[in-house]
Interface confidence: low
Amino acid sequence: LCQGSKYSTCASCPSCPDHWMKYGNHCYYFSVEKKDWISSLEFCLARDSHLLMITDKQEMSLLQDFLSEAFHWVGLRNNSGWRWEDGSPLNFSRIYSNSLVQTCGAINKNSLQASSCEVSLQWVCKKVSP
């Protein structure tokens, strides 16, 4: 299963920690509980990962397959334009926003959406697999 599929959550895959999903060269963690954006970021950093930064449309559509209607925080902020948490620009997707105070990004199965950073949402962490 681990070799044969593009992604896997199987227990026998040694390259990602328990409760993390492997896809390509990365491990992903989908939270169950909810936190505000900065607390979600700190949760990920404490586990040698970062709040999800998506590299392309292919990765985005794969991840959306795992999501429901519920929004999850990603490492995206509006700081003179929408940028990922490492500083790189968002350039393969648009983000929906209806307020200037919505400066943090979240994803669900359908879209990227701006939200107030103080809202409690689930989140996704990402790290390079060992």
Partner: antibody, heavy 116, light 108 residues
Framework: QVQLKQSGPGLVQPSQSLSITCTVS????????VHWVRQSPGKGLDWLGV???????DYNAAFISRLTISKDNSKSQVFFKMNSLQADDTAIYYC??????????WGQGTSVTVSS | QIVLTQSPAIMSASLGERVTMTCTAT???????LHWYRQKPGSSPKLWIY???TLASGVPVRFRGSGSGTSYSLTISSMEAEDAATYYC?????????FGGGTKLEIK
Amino acid sequence: QVQLKQSGPGLVQPSQSLSITCTVSGFSLTTHAVHWVRQSPGKGLDWLGVIWSGGNTDYNAAFISRLTISKDNSKSQVFFKMNSLQADDTAIYYCVRLLLPAMDYWGQGTSVTVSS
Amino acid sequence: QIVLTQSPAIMSASLGERVTMTCTATSSVSSTYLHWYRQKPGSSPKLWIYSTSTLASGVPVRFRGSGSGTSYSLTISSMEAEDAATYYCHQYRRSPYTFGGGTKLEIK
């Protein structure tokens, strides 16, 4: 282990360009950004620019007109080119890996003197 | 841009002495993105403390980082000879990413 090895000239003529290659090992350029920082005696440490894992670049506004950063993922190499160097560009130039939340590993530095 | 001012620029301490240096930012920096680097002559800077207070791998526990908002500090509980170096603070919150001017720590 993570390493960034730099190669480039030590002496550059005024108005000429500087090219430095940063060859990395122990990590992939497809998953990590590489920044460039210089250290000059008079000005301390200055951030110059970055090439992101996806290939996009950002530059310090003070250098944007004469700086180009590119890379070859398959060769694990990052290329730095700065044009129109003057005496005050004399500095040690570093390539640096980004591992959020910080720049964690630095190259050994390329000492550049701009002089005729 | 965010300007980081370090003080003092140069300081000397006796072995065993407690040492504190500060880093002040012109606007608020998230503590997650305030870091300290140590540099010895002839060497590249090394990540020393990240996210305000987390020690990088191999850093002795006598080092401690603290602060929030615009004011941060690095403290050495008991100065040792190997601690003589220049320490730089750095913010990775907002581009252009900036560094402090450094604090050179010497042995008295």
